[in-house]
């Protein structure tokens, strides 16, 4: 009886444990962009390299076709850093004439698409004006935070600029998502 | 039979279970650096306050000698802000001119160091240009990240510019990494 | 007895354990702020959303009057973005003249109120010059770290203006923390 | 605009302790280290120490034995000891910031100190 | 610790002329973190240049540093009435920071 007793008490209170080593996981890294075309007045999502040097996915986290596919629901820890790079702003020009303008900028998004839902629901923004002058820049947008992704939902990297994005360094532009 | 069925069963489920309070774990602050000399053609590394104030290692993993020591093989969320200031950056100057020019650039390095691999890896990167005209500037580079970690890796933070970094304050500058 | 012997042999080894899915967790997103009264020489406080679009807060982490309030003693993992816009800093009026003086800035710190302990303690802070010329500006500061907190602690998000904080979408501006 | 104002004694015997104080207005105190350099007569400069607004310390090696430097942040002040002062240590000693780092923008009027029996 | 020789000891210029000015260290001094500075009698010094190149705040163009290693010179294009003092050299890529002894620009 006591043996009967014990074993429903183990299985209700440890049943929703897991191995941490278990959860699913990826660290993606930035790889050259082709070209391609975008569907009007969206960002274009950044492709990623999944297995080689730093990159990985790991315990049923898939990457493909530009997506991180979440293989089960909880809670997920999300962040991505696109390093960005360009020429003088154009901006330059125009203070010059001494009037001011609507700036420049760069902007990365982190998107969840979800099959049964028609619109994407953006996660993430990071969005910095850029009114350099005289010289060539370059800057990180850092993003992270947690949220709750149901199994099948997928994520993806938005950018407002491909062509400005910096793919040369895996250590640059990356994108990672856990579960907790 | 039955009790005996059941033991190897719970080992083998629950085996990789560990308590969460037991991973290795740390947040590092930012002490005044001592002007030194360092390698040639390599960032210096920063060091840093490991038991004062916000500062704590726990669990193994500890810090020597301007690194942070990985005790333990697994999936590490690793993470850095240095803040940056100086003054007005030269290409105020080279702007005046009309020409085009190399920015002042910082930049944070996150490099992981294998004893057995001769060559330091670059975890992550920040780098950004300054071209700061007519007054001092401040600004913070924000790191993080998932990276799978040997037990025996060592980390560090390196900065382009150990005299540019604001050592004043721990909730400015900090690195540390935990496993997930 | 071997029963005897081998339930508090698990209990020993396995009394730390928890399911992750009920650990505090919260993700606070942007409202828009109303003007009040501050305390002198303190940055003021954000409020935020917790329970509508991409906000939530569960197992026992509460949010109430700008404050998240810690449940349970443990290492927590705290971020927040705040995206910041503006109109051409008066420094470009300075710059004009010739003159140097001390930038515009913008600030966010994330701070902990123990109410054991007369003076809040301030965990993270992002803070950066901005001197635009010539057009309006926007951008983000991003925190994010782990801290040792205790049963009771409250947490809140300081900014340096908060007329200048872009409220105007939850994936801009948000604040969450996670026990690890 | 970030002034630094500093007092103390004058004329010392030697043996005696040099004690100077320095007040910073117009900036902010804890976002800086703040530092004691001395200059003989018609000689160059002597960097003397450092303390942050949470009171960490740098001391040069020659000097560290015989000096104290302490900050109260709610005055905004900084203060320098330096115990068994001799005739060697006559000089105009001068509170300064540092910014960015080990170099200094803003300084004090200068106090000259002289030992002499 | 390192020491800062300068030179010449005095420099006697017109206004209008271009000065040089040398700072030797007796080492080399890491990532080039030297300092120039500016002192006119009775007050305290001025910063001018910084990280052996970069003009402080506020510091017109007319001044300009350079060199690395153990090598390092400050150059004023154009000498004004209010650039005649002492200028001094500071080194701060090894602890102890430490200061040359000066060179005096005088108006000949």
């Known amino acids: 009886l006591k043996g009967q007793e014990f074993a429903p008490s183990h299985q209700q209170v440890y049943a929703p444990l897991r191995a941490d080593g278990d959860k699913p996981r990826a660290h993606l890294t930035v790889v050259r962009q082709t070209p391609t075309q975008h569907f009007k007045n969206q960002f274009p999502a950044l492709h990623w390299e999944h297995e080689l040097g730093l990159a990985f996915t790991k315990n049923r986290m898939n990457y493909t076709n530009k997506f991180l596919l979440i293989p089960e629901s909880g809670d997920y820890f999300i962040y991505s850093q696109v390093t960005f790079r360009g020429m003088t702003s154009e901006c330059s020009e125009i203070r010059r004439a001494g009037r001011p303008n609507k700036p420049d900028s760069i902007t990365v998004v982190i998107t969840k698409v979800t099959d049964s839902y028609p619109e994407p629901t953006q996660l993430l923004m990071g969005t910095k004006s850029v009114c350099e002058v005289g010289s060539n820049w370059f800057q990180p947008i850092y993003l992270g935070a947690m949220f709750s992704l149901q199994e099948g939902d997928k994520l993806m990297v938005n950018v407002s600029d491909i062509s400005l994005v910096d793919y040369t360094k895996e250590d640059k532009t990356f994108f990672g998502a856990f579960l907790l | 039979l039955k009790g005996q069925e059941f033991a190897p069963s719970h080992q083998q489920v629950y085996a990789p279970l560990r308590a969460d309070g037991d991973k290795p774990r740390a947040h590092l602050t930012v002490v005044r650096q001592t002007p030194t000399q360092h390698f040639k053609n390599q960032f210096p590394a920063l060091h840093w306050e490991h038991e004062l104030g916000l500062a704590f290692t726990k669990n193994r993993m500890n810090y020597t000698n301007k690194f942070l020591l990985i005790p333990e093989s697994g999936d590490y969320f690793i993470y850095s802000q240095v803040t940056f200031r100086g003054m007005t950056s030269e290409c105020s100057e080279i702007r005046r001119a009309g020409r085009p020019n190399k920015p002042d650039s910082i930049t944070v390095v996150i490099t992981k160091v294998t004893d057995s691999y001769p060559e330091p890896t670059q975890l992550l990167m920040g780098t950004k240009s300054v071209c700061e005209v007519g007054s001092n500037w401040f600004q913070p580079i924000y790191l993080g990240a998932m990276f799978s970690l040997q037990e025996g890796d060592k980390l560090m933070v390196n900065v382009s510019d150990i005299s540019l970094v604001d050592y004043t304050k721990e909730d400015k500058t900090f690195f540390g990494a935990f496993l997930l | 007895l071997k029963g005897q012997e081998f339930a508090p042999s698990h209990q020993q080894v396995y009394a730390p354990l928890r399911a992750d899915g009920d650990k505090p967790r919260a993700h606070l997103t942007v409202v828009r702020q109303t003007p009040t009264q501050h305390f002198k020489n303190q940055f003021p406080a954000l409020h935020w959303e917790h329970e509508l679009g991409l906000a939530f807060t569960k197992n026992r982490m509460n949010y109430t009057n700008k404050f998240l309030l810690i449940p349970e003693s443990g290492d927590y993992f705290i971020y927040s973005q705040v995206t910041f816009r503006g109109m051409t800093s008066e420094c470009s009026e300075i710059r004009r003249a010739g003159r140097p003086n001390k930038p515009d800035s913008i600030t966010v710190v994330i701070t902990k109120v123990t109410d054991s302990y007369p003076e809040p303690t301030q965990l993270l802070m992002g803070t950066k010059s901005v001197c635009e010329v010539g057009s309006n500006w926007f951008q983000p500061i991003y925190l994010g770290a782990m801290f040792s907190l205790q049963e009771g602690d409250k947490l809140m998000v300081n900014v340096s203006d908060i007329s200048l904080v872009d409220y105007t979408k939850e994936d801009k501006t948000f604040f969450g923390a996670f026990l690890l | 605009q970030v002034q630094l104002q500093q007092w103390g004694a004058g004329l010392l015997k030697p043996s005696e302790t040099l004690s100077l104080t320095c007040a910073v207005s117009g900036g902010s105190f804890s976002d800086y280290f703040w530092t004691w350099i001395r200059q003989p007569p018609g000689k160059g400069l002597e960097w003397i120490g450092e303390?942050?607004?949470?009171?960490?310390?740098n001391y040069n090696p020659s000097l560290k034995s015989r000096v104290t430097i302490s900050v109260d942040t709610s005055m905004s002040q900084f203060s320098l000891k330096m115990t068994s002062v001799t005739a060697a240590d006559s000089a105009v000693y001068y509170c300064?910031?540092?910014?960015?780092?080990?170099?200094?923008?803003?300084w004090g009027q200068g106090t000259l100190v002289t030992v002499s029996s | 610790e390192i020491e800062l020789t300068q030179s010449p000891g005095t420099l006697s210029l017109s206004p209008g002329e271009g000065a040089t000015l040398s700072c030797r260290a007796s080492?080399?001094?890491?990532?080039?973190?030297l300092a120039w500075y500016q002192q006119k009698p009775g007050q305290a010094p001025r910063l001018l240049i910084y990280g052996a190149s970069r003009r402080a705040t506020g510091i017109p163009d007319r001044f300009s540093g350079s060199g690395s290693g153990t090598d390092f010179t400050l150059t004023i294009s154009r000498l004004e009435p209010g650039d005649f003092a002492v200028y001094f050299c500071q080194q701060y890529g090894n602890s102890p920071l430490t200061f040359g002894g000066g060179t005096k620009v005088e108006i000949k």
């Open positions: 300064a910031r540092d910014y960015p780092n080990w170099v200094f923008d803003y």
């Open positions: 080492q080399s001094v890491f990532n080039s973190y």
């Open positions: 303390i942050s607004h949470s009171g960490r310390t």
